[in-house]
C-alpha cells in the first residue's frame, strides 16, 4: 500500500497586500477517509485557518469543491491579504475518528506580504 503524501508544491508565495493568496495542496490518495485542515504554524500554538466540516473562516474558500467525490485537491484561497497574514501555512490530513487523528502534514508554504503598489 502506497504511503499517503500531502503535497504543498510551493515552498513560498509572495502576495501584495489587498490581493488574494492561493495556497496549493493535493493528496496522493483518497485513503484513509478523513478531513484535511489548514493551519498557520506548526507547533501546539498553531492557528486553524480552514476546516471544511465546521467553523468560521470568512476570508478563506476552497479552490476546488471539497465535497466532490474523489476530490484530491484541497487548495485554499485567502482574500484581502494583510501583513498580519504572513506566516507558514500547513495542509494537514486527518484520519476520521472520535476525535480525528492527525496523519500527515505537508511541508508548509511560507506566505509573505508585499506592500501594496502605489
Amino acid at each position: 500500500e502506497e504511503e499517503l503524501q500531502v503535497i504543498q508544491p510551493e515552498k513560498s508565495v509572495s502576495v501584495a497586500a489587498g490581493d488574494s493568496a492561493t495556497l496549493n495542496c493535493t493528496v496522493s490518495s483518497l485513503i484513509p477517509v478523513g478531513p484535511i485542515q489548514w493551519f498557520r504554524g506548526a507547533g501546539p500554538g498553531r492557528e486553524l485557518i480552514y476546516n471544511l466540516k465546521e467553523g468560521h473562516f470568512p476570508r478563506v474558500t476552497a479552490v476546488s469543491d471539497p465535497t466532490k467525490r474523489n476530490n484530491m485537491d484541497f487548495s485554499i484561497r485567502i482574500s484581502n491579504i494583510t501583513p498580519a497574514d504572513a506566516g507558514t501555512y500547513y495542509c494537514v490530513k486527518f484520519r476520521k475518528g472520535s476525535p480525528d487523528v492527525e496523519l500527515k502534514s505537508g511541508a508548509g508554504t511560507e506566505l509573505s506580504v508585499r506592500a501594496k503598489p502605489s
Epitope: G43, P44, G45, E47, I49, P99
Partner: antibody
Framework: DVQLVESGGGVVRPGESLRLSCAAS????????MTWVRQAPGKGPEWVSL???????YYADSVKGRFTISRDNSKSTLYLQMNSLRAEDTAVYYC???????????WGLGTLVTVSS | EIVLTQSPGTLSLSPGERATLSCRAS??????LAWYQQKPGQAPRLLIY???SRASGIPDRFSGSGSGTDFTLTISSLQSEDSAVYYC??????????FGGGTKVEIK
C-alpha cells in the same frame, strides 16, 4: 475587541480543588490555541498549560497529573480543573490567547487562587 | 527547559534617558524571543516578538535586538508611563514556554 474574563478563583486548603473558567469574546475562539499562565506574588509569569485547536493538551511539569485544561468551543470558554492544590500553586491565574507563532497576544485580568491551611 | 536570565534586576533612570535591558537564554532560541511589559495590577502586554518586531500599537521608542542566546530590549527615551516590570519569553514551537525573572524599570 478581544476580551478574556477569568473566574473561579478563591481561597482553598491544601489538597482541595478549584475550577477556573475563562470566557472569551471578540475573536473566533475555536481557531486559536489557548493557555493558562500563572504569576505568584512578586514573581515572573509561569506557563501552566495549553490546549491546541485540535484539543491536544500540554502541561508544565509542576502541574502534570493534577491540573486538567479543556475548552468548550460552543461556549467560547476555556477551563482549568485544579486538583490536589498545594501552597506553591498560590498565584494569579491568567488565561491568554496564543498566536500561531506562540506569542501570548491577549491576556485576561486574572483570577487569584490562594492555597492556605 | 530553556532558562532565561534577565539583568539588571532593577534599573532606575530619569525621563529621557536610554534604558538597556538584557535577557540571556541557557540555550539558543534563534530569534524566537519576545518582551512583555507589566504594570502593577495589570496583565503582561506583548511589546516585541521575533527578537526585534514591534507588536501592534507599540511606540517606536521600544526596540529589540539579538539572536541565539543574548537579547536586548532598548527604550530609547524613557517616559514616565514606561515605569513597569519587563519580562522576556522564548517562543519556540514547543512548551514549556519560559519567561525570565524580570527587570523593574523605575523612573526617578
Amino acid at each position: 475587541d478581544v476580551q478574556l474574563v477569568e473566574s473561579g478563583g478563591g481561597v482553598v486548603r491544601p489538597g482541595e480543588s478549584l475550577r477556573l473558567s475563562c470566557a472569551a469574546s471578540g475573536f473566533t475562539f475555536s481557531n486559536f490555541a489557548m493557555t493558562w499562565v500563572r504569576q505568584a506574588p512578586g514573581k515572573g509569569p509561569e506557563w501552566v498549560s495549553l490546549v491546541s485547536v485540535t484539543a491536544t493538551t500540554y502541561y508544565a511539569d509542576s502541574v502534570k497529573g493534577r491540573f486538567t485544561i479543556s475548552r468548550d468551543n460552543s461556549k467560547s470558554t476555556l477551563y482549568l480543573q485544579m486538583n490536589s492544590l498545594r501552597a506553591e500553586d498560590t498565584a494569579v491565574y491568567y488565561c491568554a490567547k496564543i498566536t500561531w507563532n506562540n506569542l501570548f497576544d491577549y491576556w485576561g485580568l486574572g483570577t487569584l487562587v490562594t492555597v492556605s491551611s | 527547559e530553556i532558562v532565561l536570565t534577565q539583568s539588571p534586576g532593577t534599573l532606575s533612570l530619569s525621563p529621557g534617558e536610554r534604558a538597556t535591558l538584557s535577557c540571556r537564554a541557557s540555550q539558543t532560541v534563534g530569534s524566537k524571543l519576545a518582551w512583555y511589559q507589566q504594570k502593577p495590577g495589570q496583565a503582561p502586554r506583548l511589546l516585541i516578538y521575533d527578537s526585534s518586531s514591534r507588536a501592534s500599537g507599540i511606540p517606536d521608542r521600544f526596540s529589540g535586538s539579538g539572536s541565539g542566546t543574548d537579547f536586548t530590549l532598548t527604550i530609547s527615551s524613557l517616559q514616565s508611563e514606561d515605569s513597569a516590570v519587563y519580562y522576556c519569553q522564548q517562543h519556540n514551537d514547543w512548551p514549556p514556554y519560559t519567561f525570565g525573572g524580570g527587570t523593574k524599570v523605575e523612573i526617578k
